[in-house]
């Protein structure tokens, strides 16, 4: 708290301008009218106020708006946004995408802070869903944003928003998240032709079921090994050697380098060694000739 002291003669601020950087904290408190500050918030960012001076300006706004700032002030907070706590932000009602952009710009190039996370949460909840424009904005500032959401939160993403997603936006997503996003992507891109469809759907394939992988294997897609290694193990296991060969095309040779890693390792264990030998890659660990494979999970389901 800054002590209440009278403003020295001749120092009363008539406007928010650069001369205020020379004011001590107590002078800012005494000489800057909160209502003037609120109406000229757009000027604050143009002036190099220090950490301590911004504290005083925030205190003045807090006194003027104890129930939370209006959006007209929020939009022009600039670096003053960095002084806000998540508790402050929870009092706000931010509806404009322009306001969101203005505040994200302040923290650009830095990792997502609790303030930013709270702001985004308030904004998205206010909109009811993560629409395309919002998703576009958020992933532009924070490429990993999508993967920071829970599967439950991702379920509110409409398929139309999937068009805004870039491959790098999914880099840190786990299989549970891709399970939610893949069906939305499949729906969003369903009217595209084969090769274009594969380019768009490729980043989401970590959530694809076996039957979709089987279908892709019939389309000469030449999936690269990096994508194959991100597929769900349970989706890869039922694929035949022929299907994997068709799915990977010329990239099938890469299986040898990955034979000790999932899902390739587990897939090899499920294939007949004879079939693996047809690839000519020297893959070992398949089921020897003459052995009978019992699918115990199927047996349990029947009993």
């Amino acid at each position: 708290e800054v002590e209440k002291t009278a403003c020295p003669s001749g120092k009363k601020a008539r406007e928010i301008d650069e001369s205020l950087i020379f004011y001590k904290k107590w002078e800012l408190e005494a000489c800057v009218d909160a209502a003037l500050l609120a109406t000229q918030m757009d000027r604050v960012n143009a002036i190099p106020f220090t950490y301590e001076q911004l504290d005083v300006l925030k205190h003045k706004l807090d006194e003027l708006y104890p129930q939370g700032y209006p959006e007209s002030v929020i939009q022009h907070l600039g670096y003053l946004f960095l002084k806000m706590s998540p508790e402050d932000i929870r009092k706000w009602n931010v509806t404009s995408l322009e306001t969101l952009k203005a505040l994200l710009e302040v923290n650009k190039g830095h990792e997502m802070s609790p303030q930013v996370a709270t702001l985004i949460d308030r904004f998205v909840k206010g909109r009811g869903q993560l629409d395309k424009d919002t998703l576009d904005t958020l992933t532009a500032f924070y490429p990993g944003y999508l993967c920071s959401l829970s599967p439950e939160e991702l379920s509110s993403v409409p398929p139309s928003s999937i068009w805004a997603v870039r491959p790098q936006d999914l880099d840190t997503c786990d299989p549970r998240q891709l399970d939610v996003l893949y069906p939305k992507a499949r729906l969003a891109f369903q009217n595209m032709n084969g090769s274009e469809y594969f380019v768009k759907i490729q980043s989401f394939l970590g959530g694809a079921p076996t039957e979709d992988l089987k279908a892709l294997s019939q389309q000469n897609v030449s999936m690269d090994l990096a994508t194959f290694m991100k597929l769900r193990t349970d989706a890869v296991l039922p694929l035949t050697v022929a299907e994997v060969q068709k799915l990977l095309g010329p990239h099938v040779e890469g299986l040898k380098a990955e034979e000790r890693h999932r899902p390739v390792r587990d897939w090899i264990l499920r294939q007949r060694q004879d079939d693996l030998d047809t690839l000519g890659l020297g893959l070992q660990g398949g089921i020897p000739n003459g052995y009978l494979v019992l699918d115990l999970s199927m047996q349990e389901a029947l009993s």
């Epitope: 650069e18 960012n45 143009a46 002036i47 190099p48 106020f49 220090t50 950490y51 911004l54 670096y79 003053l80 960095l82 002084k83 302040v106 923290n107 190039g109 830095h110």
Partner: nanobody, 116 residues
Framework: QVQLVESGGGLVQPGGSLRLSCAAS????????VAWYRQAPGEQREPVAA???????IYADSVKGRFTISRDNAKNTVYLQMSSLKPEDTAVYYC??????????WGQGTSVTVSP
Amino acid sequence: QVQLVESGGGLVQPGGSLRLSCAASGSMFSINAVAWYRQAPGEQREPVAAMTSGGSTIYADSVKGRFTISRDNAKNTVYLQMSSLKPEDTAVYYCNGGWSLAMDYWGQGTSVTVSP
């Protein structure tokens, strides 16, 4: 993280000149308001010169007419040209602006000593 590197300080006689430079990582100085500050031994850090994001400049009364703040956006560098230096200008000089200023991150500063 933003990095601020001030340089150009040194020992100079009264009446002499120095040109301080401050380089920042990223495009911080090309888009933000910036300022030079100084801290004399046993004193608080105080602003001496500032430039708004619009380019207008302002100076502390004690340095008006002697110091000039400028910036080169292409080099992402801010300068402080100091002339007619006085012993009372002796201090460590810092520059700052934008995100790092709001977050209270500072460089190491550059020391200026004005002595006969």
